[in-house]
Interface confidence: medium
């Protein structure tokens, strides 16, 4: 069966300077390939976090994704700023051998609304 990516919250509100968790779970780790978080859609979308080892300031994974059969790819964004507002998508990719990774499924998106302190 096809992997499903679930973002249970349609929206979250967070005060500037605080942190927020964006939840994302998958039903399967197959096919092999990374999970990445993006803000926005289409050509304007921005890579926010990738579960592939790179360092992303202010963002870290919530659960231990090195554990076997971990299906939780939620992230915590710290010190949120108004510029962080937007819709965040958790996206599952299939790893390519020689060609680029292929995007195969996305969560429904979570709108982050940043409140003034």
């Amino acid at each position: 069966t096809e992997v499903k990516v679930t973002q249970p919250e349609k929206s979250v509100s967070v005060a500037a300077g605080d942190s927020t968790i964006l939840n994302c779970t998958v039903t399967s780790l197959l096919p092999v390939g990374p999970i990445r978080w993006y803000r926005g859609v289409g050509q304007s979308r921005l890579l926010i976090y990738s579960f592939t080892g790179e360092h992303f300031p202010r963002i870290r994974n919530v659960s231990d994704t090195t554990k076997r059969n971990n299906m939780d790819f939620s992230i915590r964004i710290s010190n949120v700023t108004p510029e962080d507002a937007g819709t965040y998508y958790c996206v599952k990719f299939q790893r390519g051998s020689s060609e680029p990774d292929t995007e195969i499924q996305s969560g429904g998106g979570t709108e982050v609304y940043v409140l003034a302190k």
Epitope: V41, G109, Y113
Partner: antibody, heavy 119, light 108 residues
């Protein structure tokens, strides 16, 4: 059972204002995002505006931005749409629509109220 | 903004026949697509969500399929009450939430 009842429609002249209401019952109103969707005579559906359950997240279609204001009173289980500077192209049946609690599709709709803008 | 294109604009069929309605998205919406039915003078009614899941109380003659940019609503055997206008709606890119232009299923 979920019930959504719109009111406030009528005939107005271009440039005038109108306030639509949607009385909700049969569900926990404050827990659901609510929308206005309109349908011009003989045309398709056009999303107008949405407001989150708490009222703090609001969006508008470009066609109404700056002229329409969505609001809600959770103590009265009522959704509102204040329409200012009305134009002939705003003539439509306006539906109040309740969103699914997880995704932005519409589980329940009101019967609609007709707004006619004509000189 | 994601644009949804429905085809055909009108489908003329007889009761008992199979209806196949198409909805095409300008970019992938994965399976975040809903279908609604609207009869004259009535509000739309949710039929399908998640591209293929039937809403509560919807008969099993209605089925949805597809993912990405191509979607289909199938009515396996048209009943008299099924003659109506059908709209698709995407809820992947939001807002604005967008609807297709509709397909009218009329009696031949």
């Amino acid at each position: 059972d979920v019930q959504l009842v719109e009111s406030g429609g009528g005939v107005v002249r271009p440039g005038e204002s109108l306030r639509l209401s949607c009385a909700a019952s049969g569900f926990t109103f404050s827990s659901y995002d609510m929308n206005w969707v309109r349908q011009a005579p003989g045309e398709g559906l056009e999303w107008v505006s949405l407001i989150s359950g708490s009222g703090e997240i609001i969006y508008y279609a470009d066609s109404v931005k700056g002229r329409f204001t969505i609001s809600r009173d959770n103590s009265k289980n009522t959704l509102y749409l204040q329409m200012n500077s009305l134009r002939a192209e705003d003539t439509a049946v306006y539906y109040c629509a309740k969103e699914n609690n997880r995704y932005r599709f519409f589980d329940d709709w009101g019967l609609g109220t007709l707004v006619t803008v004509s000189s | 903004e994601i644009v949804l294109t429905q085809s055909p604009g009108t489908l003329s069929l007889s009761p008992g026949e199979r209806a196949t309605l198409s909805c095409r998205a300008s970019q992938s919406v994965y399976t975040y697509l809903a279908w609604y039915q609207q009869k004259p003078g009535q509000a739309p009614r949710l039929l399908i969500y998640g591209a293929s899941s039937r809403a509560t109380g919807i008969p099993d003659r209605f089925s949805g399929s597809g993912s990405g940019t191509e979607f289909t609503l199938t009515i396996s055997s048209l009943q008299s009450e099924d003659f109506a206008v059908y709209y698709c709606q995407q809820y992947y890119d939001r807002p604005p939430l967008t609807f297709g232009g509709g397909t009218k299923v009329e009696i031949k």
